[in-house]
Amino acid sequence: APTSSSTKKTQLQLEHLLLDLQMILNGINNYKNPKLTRMLTFKFYMPKKATELKHLQCLEEELKPLEEVLNLAQSKNFHLRPRDLISNINVIVLELKGSETTFMCEYADETATIVEFLNRWITFCQSIISTLT
């Protein structure tokens, strides 16, 4: 059974994942982002079901394509580069989903834009956090 400290750690990790996904989304939605139109042409796979931590496998499998799209936001001044954000998200996802069980991700038939994709995983984090608090 999960202990109070392990639940607290899971919650903190989910909060960090949520914050970085929101940060990426905010950067994409920024009115000063000239690459937004191009970014929206890329399609992402959405999970058929995302209700448990093991479903983060579906997010993990889309992190490389996500980084490639974020690289379009070429800036003279990156405070954080796309690879910094994706690397941190990857570490959190691996810790949250665990490596004991191998879960085969099932994807929905419809693909999504980067904005829809990020919003889906933001909602996922918020939903899981709400069950822990």
Epitope: H16, L19, M23, G27, S75, L80, L85, N88, I89
Partner: nanobody, 119 residues
């Protein structure tokens, strides 16, 4: 409006350590990047390290393995632990607050704190 107050600078011998702190107050958003930039005399301001509210980090190559950036979201404070300091680390260190990860402009800058590495 965001106010940034830095502390922890000073004079240190080569090989020594310092810990810089920067507390942000005012209109803080929960989603942000805070970091440290530095400017040596006659040189351009350069990134030292940055960290997102979610914990993503970026370090300048010249400080990797020596400096560690961390933050306390509850206190809106960012820290820079500087170890194995070298004379070339001498500069004014500025705290930065940004609402985006890729912006070409930084939203707010601190006043700066002097770090001098000399024997």
């Amino acid at each position: 409006e965001v106010q940034l107050v830095e502390s922890g600078g000073g004079l240190v011998q080569p090989g020594g350590s310092l810990r810089l702190s920067c507390a942000a107050s005012g209109s803080i958003f929960s989603i942000n990047v805070m970091g440290w930039y530095r400017q040596a005399p006659g040189k351009q301001r350069e990134l030292v390290a940055a960290i997102s509210s979610g914990g993503s980090t970026n370090y300048a190559d010249s400080v990797k393995g020596r400096f560690t950036i961390s933050r306390d979201n509850a206190k809106n404070t960012v820290y820079l632990q500087m170890n194995s300091l070298k004379p070339e680390d001498t500069a004014v260190y500025y705290c930065a607050y940004a609402s985006s990860w890729y912006e070409d402009e930084t939203d707010y800058w601190g006043q700066g704190t002097q770090v001098t590495v000399s024997s």
